[in-house]
Amino acid sequence: ESGYAQNGDLEDAELDDYSFSCYSQLEVNGSQHSLTCAFEDPDVNTTNLEFEICGALVEVKCLNFRKLQEIYFIETKKFLLIGKSNICVKVGEKSLTCKKIDLTTIVKPEAPFDLSVIYREGANDFVVTFNTSHLQKKYVKVLMHDVAYRQEKDENKWTHVNLSSTKLTLLQRKLQPAAMYEIKVRSIPDHYFKGFWSEWSPSYYFRTPEINNSSGEMD
């Protein structure tokens, strides 16, 4: 039994919960922006349901989303990025629920990449570096990064460090010797834009040196 009504009878549809959330990604493909929306309830029957955005667009009044499995997606250059747009869930011509959203307040950055850790023996530290595509962007350039690391055996004991640069130094004495560590990083808009954390970068794994027994230092 579908959760929406067919044959023009929309009464059942209006009983369902069509709450949804969206995020934007600016300049995600050259000068193209994207907008992704999905229902909060994964059990919503999405057959015949469409998403539409109207307002704060360039040259057009409204745009329809493409459906990709359970998400709805637009990639376009036509977002004005000034003011509020109206995003609606529709069945046919009828709007079931709508949200007014400024697309610059729901920005989800792209995940950082090329995460690596280099051990400096002389300095007794580890230099963590990573890259972000946002350094080259016109709009969302300023990000806060969250570097998380843990000893591999401590499943939920993550240590987090927030930073605005793409380089972090971890002191050797703060880490356990002869241990395997996992490290990862994500980003969030920090200035001029608002939104959500990116996906995590792929994890990087590194091993700390053993302790040198004579000096009490790690090898």
């Epitope: 307002g55 704060a56 009044k61 990025l81 000034i82 003011g83 509020k84 109206n86 400024d102 307040t105």
Partner: nanobody, 118 residues
Framework: EVQLVESGGGLVQAGGSLRLSCESS????????MGWFRQAPGKEREFLAA????????HYSDSVQGRFTISRDNAKNTVYLQMNSLKSEDTGRYYC???????????WGQGTQVTVSS
Amino acid sequence: EVQLVESGGGLVQAGGSLRLSCESSGSTFSSDAMGWFRQAPGKEREFLAAIGWSGAVTHYSDSVQGRFTISRDNAKNTVYLQMNSLKSEDTGRYYCAEDYDTDVWQYWGQGTQVTVSS
């Protein structure tokens, strides 16, 4: 109710500059888009420039691109329009607007007169 008060208009010679200000009484100013428009005598009101809530995104009409600059100070609830290389056709009443919501500006000021003499 949001009130917008424009200032900075006046008489200026062609080629000169003016800086218009628009102060908002609105408590949501720092999250609202702002825009500038003008109405020349006997003509319809035309869009000039708009700026997003943070100032990061701006948009200009072709007629003022490169000559006018829109900016904002959220601490002062004020939006500005810096107008350079003014021409006689820039003469008109200049209005600011607040809260661009689904292609409609929700609030308007009373305007300030700009006259460019040649």
